[in-house]
């Protein structure tokens, strides 16, 4: 699946510049291409390493240029090699002296197994010496000096694969540098056959294309493309998709093209001769001008493309009528696709006429693996091939190539695939707290292995030996409810990134055990201040059915100072605890539970203030309202936290002695209003309100005045008091 081409310009070396260019056309191979000396074909050649450079005029090509060096440095056999999926594709070629005594008829010769073959060398220099012929450096044949013909031939009546190799010819007094070389390529199979046992019939390769004995595919000559090599490229272009161009002023003149075996080497279409510098004579076209035009309707014979058919006609001789063929085109393929590792179903869509079939559409992975469609359908104008890659992995990232090869031509479109690693948490989730039926879990997605961004998180949980359940979570802290008590649970987190199949493998598993169902909280809990620095918590005696030892855990917290918290363990046979070393005039919250090995259920919270260490402040917002001839409503508010135990309302008639006052003591500090009754009509009273706590009474700043209304006969005198 690699389009490797070696251009030998020129194979006959004189004192002019000569070069080798190796092109990996269309897409970048995984490993770099190399050019080297082919010592297998020719042992005794120069040992100096070649100076291989990048061919800047092409996207992916290497080049060796000899600038009029001594020809001995150049004479020899060469190869260009590219690797796909660890398999080497090697193209061979040769360079020899233009001043050699003999010259080969062709640089390479491809024959089928069993063919009757004549390998020919043309005598260029006449010498009174024997002529000798060697194969791969070993002597095979000599011709006495008086019998050396103008065309020196090696005759192989039944060519076999072992006959393949480099044949050289020279006079006996000559040497490597006066030798002429030609390479015989013998296809493993008889004519028009391919396959491991050569039983499969070849596609008929047109325009001198050669059927590959291992794949059955046509190797098309430079200037032709498509499944059968029927489609001619634009003049001066070559390559499997005709994307490469000869940059010379006369196109591909003086370029000898060498392709993978069994093709060998030839001129581009339109040229012939050992140096490919002779244009085809009239009526001939194709590589080495070996094809003859037989245009049906007297159409023009183009030396590059053959018969140029008029509208409505097609075929090599323009012998077929019908809809003109259209080179396939690849449609709607993005340049870059990001996919998640796992199953991947790339789609390749192509137009053209005839529409590509399933067998004509392939997908080439960066490592050279060729995929065939798994599913295929036609629409009105397109062929759609769906490929299946069961497990695409990050090493599969790189340039993939959608390739379509029909009788109407070939097209390849590379596109970049970036395979992302699915995210997986590196750590198990942390269990912050558990109860008998819940767990509080920290589900941090960081750190994770793989590629982000993280789109979603699933928390998987299960009791050991049961099936997994999951819940989608968004926050980092999550409470898992409705768990079974005293049960081993397993937890893990699955992360997902954007795109289809973005869910990663769940991360490491955390095990935890829910608590047993605890005992109920103590009953009859009461929290009362004991002193300025102590509170007393009491409860009813605790009886349990369990034989386990138990204790009461009391937790107290200051509501003012959040850091002030204390947990006290109280033996289970006690019914109270003194919470001491507290701060005066501070509110505390207290709760209790009964613990065995398992923790019990917490009680509701109780709140209480420690006794005050100062006099209470005066009641505030004192208002006197709803005044009648004998009653009035007094209301007030008190400030929390001063251990106020009672409110005293003191009132007296204006002008009366101080000791003639009446005190009303309200012992429920939560009462905030009181109705004075039994007042005299049309009388002015002075009213004071005090707050009383463990230290004493508050100091009123001033008295409030109240004047009752005139007597009203309707009002019934219910007397004083409450």
């Amino acid at each position: 699946a690699m389009d490797l081409i070696l251009i030998n310009s020129l194979p006959l070396v004189s004192d002019a510049e000569t070069s080798l260019t190796c092109i990996a056309s269309g897409w970048h191979p995984h490993e770099p291409i190399t050019i080297g000396r082919d010592f297998e074909a020719l042992m005794n050649q120069h040992q100096d390493p070649l100076e291989v450079t990048q061919d800047v005029t092409r996207e992916w090509a290497k080049k060796v240029v000899w600038k009029r060096e001594k020809a001995s440095k150049i004479n020899g056999a060469y190869f260009c090699e590219g690797r796909v999926r660890g398999q080497a594709i090697r193209i061979r070629t040769m360079k020899m002296r233009q001043q050699a005594s003999f010259l080969p008829a062709t640089l390479t010769m491809t024959v089928d197994r069993g063919d009757n073959v004549n390998i020919s060398f043309k005598k260029v220099l006449i010498k009174e010496e024997d002529a000798v012929i060697y194969k791969n450096g070993s002597f095979i044949h000599s011709v006495p000096r008086h019998e050396v013909p103008d065309i020196l031939e090696v005759h192989l009546p039944h060519a076999q694969p072992q006959d393949a190799g480099v044949y050289s010819a020279r006079y006996i007094g000559g040497n490597l540098f006066t030798s002429a070389f030609t390479r015989l390529i013998v296809r493993r199979c008889e004519a028009q056959k391919w396959g491991p046992d050569c039983s499969r019939p070849c596609t008929t390769c047109k325009n001198n294309g050669v059927c590959h004995e291992d794949t059955g595919e046509c190797i098309c000559p430079p200037g032709f493309m498509g499944r059968t090599c029927e489609k001619a490229c634009e003049p001066h272009t070559f390559g499997r998709t005709c994307k490469e161009r000869c940059s010379g002023p006369e196109g591909c003149k003086s370029y000898v093209f060498c392709l993978p075996d069994p093709y060998g080497c030839s001129c581009a279409t339109g040229w012939r001769g050992l140096q490919c510098n002779e244009a085809c004579p009239s009526g001939y076209y194709g590589p080495d001008c070996k094809l003859r035009c037989h245009c049906t309707n007297e159409e023009i014979c183009d030396r590059f493309q053959g018969c140029l058919c008029s509208q409505g006609w097609q075929g090599l001789q323009c012998e077929k009528e019908g809809r003109p063929r259209m080179t396939p085109q690849i449609e709607d393929l993005p340049d870059h696709i990001e996919v998640n590792s796992g199953k991947f179903n790339p789609i390749c869509k192509a137009s053209g006429w005839p529409l590509p079939t399933s067998e004509e559409m392939t997908l080439v992975k960066p490592d050279g693996t060729v995929l065939q469609p798994n599913d295929f359908n036609y629409t009105d104008r397109f062929s759609v091939a769906i490929f299946t890659v069961n497990r695409v992995l990050p090493p599969d990232s790189g340039v993939w190539v959608c390739s379509v090869n029909t009788v109407a031509g070939m097209v390849e479109k590379p596109f970049n695939i970036s395979v992302k690693v699915l995210p997986e948490p590196l750590h198990a989730p942390n269990v912050i707290d558990t109860g008998h039926n819940f767990a509080i879990i920290n589900i941090s997605s960081e750190p994770y292995f793989g590629d982000g961004p993280i789109k979603s998180k699933k928390l998987f949980y299960k009791p050991v030996n049961q099936a997994w359940k999951y819940i989608e979570v968004t926050n980092e802290i999550f409470t898992l409810n409705y768990l079974e008590p005293r049960t081993d649970y397993e937890l893990c987190v699955q992360l997902a990134r954007p795109g289809e199949g973005g869910e990663g493998h769940p991360g490491p598993v955390r095990r935890f055990t829910t608590a047993s169902i605890g005992l109920p909280p103590p009953r009859g809990l009461s929290l009362l201040p004991k002193s300025q620095t102590a509170l007393n918590l009491t409860w009813q005696p605790i009886f349990t059915n369990s034989e386990d030892e138990f204790y009461v855990e009391v937790e107290r917290r200051s509501l003012q100072t959040t850091s002030d918290q204390q947990n006290i363990k109280v033996p289970g046979n006690l019914t109270s605890v003194l919470l001491s070393n507290l701060v005066p005039r501070e509110q505390y919250t207290v709760r209790a539970r009964v613990n065995t090995k398992a923790q019990g259920e917490w009680s509701e919270e109780l709140r209480a203030w420690t006794l005050s260490d100062i006099l209470p402040p005066q009641p505030e917002n004192i208002k006197i309202s709803n005044i009648t001839d004998s009653t009035a409503m007094v209301s007030w508010t008190i400030v929390d936290g001063y251990s106020i135990s009672s409110i005293i309302i003191r009132y007296k008639v204006q002008g009366k002695n101080e000791d003639q006052h009446i005190d009303v003591k309200i012992k429920n500090a939560t009462v905030t209003q009181y109705q004075l009754k039994g007042l005299e009509p049309e009388t002015t009273y002075h009213v004071d309100i005090f707050a009383e706590n463990n230290i004493g009474s508050s100091n009123p700043a001033f008295s409030h005045e109240l004047r009752t209304l005139p007597h009203s006969p309707a009002s019934a005198d219910l007397g004083g008091g409450k």
Epitope: N44, Q47, K73, G173, N175, F177
Partner: antibody, heavy 122, light 112 residues
Framework: EVQLVESGGGLVQPGGSLRLSCAAS????????MHWVRQAPGKGLEWVAG????????VYADSVKGRFTISRDNSKNTLYLQMNSLRAEDTAVYYC???????????????WGQGTLVTVSS | DIQMTQSPSSLSASVGDRVTITCRSS???????????LDWYQQKPGKAPKLLIY???NRASGVPSRFSGSGSGTDFTLTISSVQPEDFATYYC?????????FGQGTKVEIK
């Protein structure tokens, strides 16, 4: 004109060293293997050493092995023979010769230099 | 090493005579193909040797046709069909089958 010109001969004491050179012209020097052949006064020819066109193959006569070194510089079209630990029996005219081959096989020496005399004596 | 033995060590001939020199090797010089790895050289006094025949029977460029080489295996012959004044010299055979390359001791052809 095709020619080989030796230089560097002379009188040297036993155990001494000498370096012979052979300058080539008129042909493509690095197309061919090269050799040194010597001839003791009034005696026959004796092959001394040979070197292939690219110095890939070098061979010596047993009588000089370990003492003489043949080398070539293709960029200068020159062949060399470094002679160490010279003995009286090394006294001879030393010829450089061009092979018709590029390797040391099927040798034939079609071009010879005029020779340079090496005398080893105390 | 391969030993090369020439005979005679010297001979006298008149101009126009047919001269034959033989050379025997201690082992066969016939290679796997039909060529024998043996060369013949001519040396005149005070001059460098000159190649006459290579690979047993192939005349070197510029060598007159009166010189010919023959023989195979271990026995070889250099023949001068009609000796000329310029042919009086010493002739050496040399084997090239294996290194070290070895010469015969020489055959001196003198004017009678």
């Amino acid at each position: 004109e095709v020619q080989l010109v030796e230089s560097g001969g002379g009188l040297v004491q036993p155990g001494g060293s000498l370096r012979l050179s052979c300058a080539a012209s008129g042909f493509t020097f690095d197309d061919y293997a090269m050799h040194w052949v010597r001839q003791a006064p009034g005696k026959g020819l004796e092959w001394v050493a040979g070197i292939s066109w690219n110095s890939g193959s070098i061979v010596y006569a047993d009588s000089v092995k370990g003492r003489f070194t043949i080398s070539r510089d293709n960029s200068k079209n020159t062949l060399y023979l470094q002679m160490n630990s010279l003995r009286a029996e090394d006294t001879a005219v030393y010829y450089c010769a061009k092979d018709i081959r590029e390797q040391l096989v099927e040798d034939a020496f079609d071009i010879w230099g005029q020779g340079t005399l090496v005398t080893v004596s105390s | 090493d391969i030993q090369m033995t020439q005979s005679p060590s010297s001979l006298s001939a008149s101009v126009g005579d047919r001269v034959t020199i033989t050379c025997r090797s201690s082992q066969s010089l016939l290679h796997s193909h039909r060529y024998n790895y043996l060369d013949w050289y001519q040396q005149k006094p005070g001059k460098a040797p000159k190649l006459l025949i290579y690979l047993g029977s192939n005349r070197a460029s510029g060598v007159p046709s009166r010189f010919s080489g023959s023989g195979s295996g271990t026995d070889f012959t250099l023949t001068i069909s009609s000796v000329q004044p310029e042919d009086f010299a010493t002739y050496y055979c040399m084997q090239t089958l294996q290194t070290p390359l070895t010469f015969g001791q020489g055959t001196k052809v003198e004017i009678k």
